[in-house]
Each structure stands twice: as C-alpha cells, then as structure tokens.
Interface confidence: medium
C-alpha cells in the first residue's frame, strides 16, 4: 500500500478533525491501517489512535478527537499499515477550519411585511468561533432551485430579516444557511437542514 500525496484535513474547531488519504490500491481501512496522533504541546503526551474507515475503495478517512483546540495547536500524525509507516506529517486545526453546520433554522413573522430567519451557532462562548462566524443564507424556490437569492450576513447575530414581498406570493420557498470563520483559514460549513414555507402576502390593489 502507498499513500498518494498529502491528506486533505479539516477541523470543526471544537472536537473533531478529519483527514482523508488516497491510496494506490483498494484497502480495508479499518483492518489494515491505523493513525497515531498527538498534540505537540505535550511533548510527552500519550499517542492517540484513530481507526480509519473507507470513504471509497482506495480512500481512507479518520475522524480524530481533538478537544478544545487553540490557534497554536499542532498535531503530529503517523499513518501505519501493521508495522510499516506509510506517512507522517502534522496538522494545525486552526489552519483549515470547516465549521459545524448551523442548526435550528427557523422562520418567524417579524412585522407584517417582513420575515425573520434565525438559526443556532453551535459554538460555546469559550470558543474562538463563537463571535467569529459569518453566514450565507440561500433562499430558493422549491419548484425551481436555480432561482435563488443569497444573503451574506457579516454581523455576528445569527438572524436575517428580509421583506416578504422580495419573494413571489403564492410560492413555496426553501432556506438554508452555512457559516465560515473570518479569522481562521478554511472553508464554508455544510449547509444546515433546510426549511420550507409558503410565501403569501396581499398584493396592493394596483397590482391585483
């Protein structure tokens, strides 16, 4: 077995980092491979072990427990096949952050002519991402997802108000939200679970 190139790693910056390796042949990741990793701050910390699983016949993925990361953290990692080291390297969780997807996306009637969307940021107040995340809200027609509006929410509060009449009346719409860090390098989270609602408002007399 040979490792092809470097792994792709990202961290949710709260409890888990995920690395994915491409191999030169089909492999049963969990029985043939083993990943050892340790936080380099503790020079004599215990080696932690992650048992990879297959994400494809020649691709192994490992979800490593990394409790409460800080910006300076760096992990030493070694991928082994029985008694042979296939790869070694290091990973900084703060260097490639893919935040947890928001949840509890909810639509509220704000005032008569506005909708209010709220969602939950899943990071506690002692985590750097608690006040750092920016959001992207995607609102699309349920019957035609290619027709959509995107709102970039650059303020900290997980909420968005928008006029009811910016959308068509008598149409079902779907909303979803994702987040990313402003301070740390990384990518957008996965999209949150979506919500769907029926957009209805009374047209002004002149438009009826």
């Amino acid at each position: 077995i040979k490792v092809l190139g470097e792994p792709t790693c990202f961290s949710d910056y709260i409890r888990t980092s995920t690395c994915e390796w491409f191999l030169d042949s089909a492999v049963d990741c969990s029985s043939q491979l083993c990943l050892h990793y340790r936080l380099m701050f503790f020079e004599f910390s215990e080696n932690l072990t992650c048992i990879p699983r297959n994400s494809a016949s020649t691709v192994c993925v490992c979800h490593m427990e990394m409790n409460r990361p800080v910006q300076s953290d760096r992990y030493q990692m070694e991928l082994w096949a029985e008694h042979r080291q296939l790869w070694q390297g290091s990973f900084s969780p703060s260097g490639n952050v893919k935040p947890l997807a928001p949840d509890n996306l909810t639509l509220h009637t704000n005032v008569s002519d506005e909708w209010l969307l709220t969602w939950n940021n899943l990071y506690p107040s002692n985590n750097l991402l608690y006040k750092d995340l920016i959001s992207m809200v995607n609102i699309s027609r349920e019957d035609n997802p290619a027709e959509f509006i995107v709102y970039n929410v650059t303020y900290k509060e997980p909420r968005l108000s928008f006029p009811i009449n910016i959308l068509m009346s008598g149409v079902y719409y779907t909303a979803r939200v994702r987040v990313r860090s402003q301070i740390l390098t990384g990518t957008w989270s996965e999209w949150s679970p979506s919500i769907t609602w029926y957009n209805h408002f009374q047209l002004p007399l002149i438009q009826r």
């Epitope: 004599f44 910390s45 215990e46 800080v70 910006q71 300076s72 953290d73 750097l128």
Partner: antibody, heavy 124, light 107 residues
C-alpha cells in the same frame, strides 16, 4: 483544596537508595502531569523529573539512569525511586502538580501547586 | 538543552521601588516561561505563566513580559512582603530548566 504531601526523605549513604512518595488530594490525580523539583541547601531550584497522567516520563540529565519516577493513580500517589545516590543529590525534594491553561491563541503550562518538601541527605 | 540565565543574582531595593528581573534563554522558547516566588523557609509559589499571565490571587503589582529569548518579571511598587528569591522556569522543551534565582532584599 489541592494538597501534596511528600515523605520518605532521610539520611542515606553514597551509593544507597531511597524512595520518595507524594500523596495527592483535592484534584483528579490521573488527569495531571506531576513533577519532582529539588533544592540543594542554600541553592536554587532544579527540575528533576516529570510524569504524564498516563505514565510517560522525562528526566534531567543529572539523574537519568539513576532515578525513576512513577505513579499509582489508584492510590493518588507519586513516587521517585532514587538509586546510586551521590552527595550532590542532597536536597529538599518537592513534588509539584502541573497546571494547564488555554486561551483562544495558545496553551500554557506551569508548576501550579507544590508540596512542602522532604529532605534527602546523602552522606557517609 | 536550554539554559536560563537569570540576572541579577541579587538586588536590594527600597519600598515603593520598581524592580525588574531578567531571564535570558539560550534559544527561543516563545512565551513558555513561568515565574516563581520563594519566601525564606517556604515552598515556591507560582506568580506568572505564559510569560505575562498573572496567576489567580497574585497581586497586580507583579507583571511579566518578553518573548523569544528575553523575559522580565517586574514588581511595580515594592512591598515588604516581596522579600524573596524569584525564579524563572522554561517549560518549552525537555528537560525543563530554572534560572539560578534572584534574591531580592529590602533596603
């Protein structure tokens, strides 16, 4: 509150052996690294050895191969087995609990709590 | 191994004075240094960790600074109870090492 109580010190001849103990209370002993630090009479502090919660060890060059640090997490006790003792090992031996703190940017460690010490005298 | 050179080895100062103790590391240790106070006949006590972070319960007249290889402990407004020997400790790499100590006397 956190308490560390050393015992086992005394007078020993050069070449002899001694085992120091440090009884810990007031914290989850197995979760913390522990250290031995010594101080020769009228001199400064010298770090001697450390052991992680899981038993990984480190030593100062001056004691490597002669001293062995160990711990019994069930008994909340830290040990220092000292062999082939020399007159220059004469000192007060302190056990110290490692503390850890992290902010957004980095992690910090330090010797957070110290015992009162036990005197080891190596003399003929 | 990293050597910590502490200076001065002793100093005498008057009550209310501003006192600075320096520790020089033989190589860069980032901010991984802590400072300890040992009063006569007592066990050492943690004052500062991470070069500049004050341990809970330590008076605010104590402060730490520096980075890389040069670090300082400052007492602004010396009090009689500060009579002690002060030590720096590098915990950047094994083996840990203390400075030689600075004995602070009150004039």
């Amino acid at each position: 509150q956190v308490q560390l109580v050393e015992s086992g010190g005394g007078l020993v001849q050069p070449g002899g052996s001694l085992r120091l103990s440090c009884a810990a209370s007031g914290f989850t002993f197995s979760s913390y690294a522990m250290n031995w630090v010594r101080q020769a009479p009228g001199k400064g502090l010298e770090w001697v050895s450390a052991i992680s919660g899981g038993g990984s060890t480190r030593y100062a060059d001056s004691v490597k191969g002669r001293f062995t640090i160990s711990r019994d997490n069930a008994k909340n006790t830290l040990y220092l087995q000292m062999n082939s003792l020399k007159p220059e090992d004469t000192a007060v031996y302190y056990c110290a609990k490692s503390g850890f703190y992290s902010d957004y940017e980095r992690r910090y460690r330090y010797l957070e709590v110290w015992g009162q010490g036990t005197l080891v005298t190596v003399s003929s | 191994d990293i050597q910590m050179t502490q200076s001065p080895s002793s100093l005498s100062a008057s009550l209310g004075d501003r006192v600075t103790i320096t520790c020089q590391a033989s190589q860069s240790i980032r901010p991984e240094i802590s400072w300890y106070q040992q009063k006569p006949g007592q066990t050492p006590k943690l004052l500062i960790y991470g070069a500049s972070r004050l341990q809970t319960g330590v008076p605010s007249r104590f402060s730490g600074g520096g980075s890389g290889t040069s670090f300082t402990l400052t007492i602004s407004g010396l009090e009689a109870e500060d009579l002690a020997t002060y030590y720096c400790l590098q915990d950047y790499s094994w083996p840990y090492s203390f400075g030689q100590g600075t004995k602070l006397e009150i004039k």
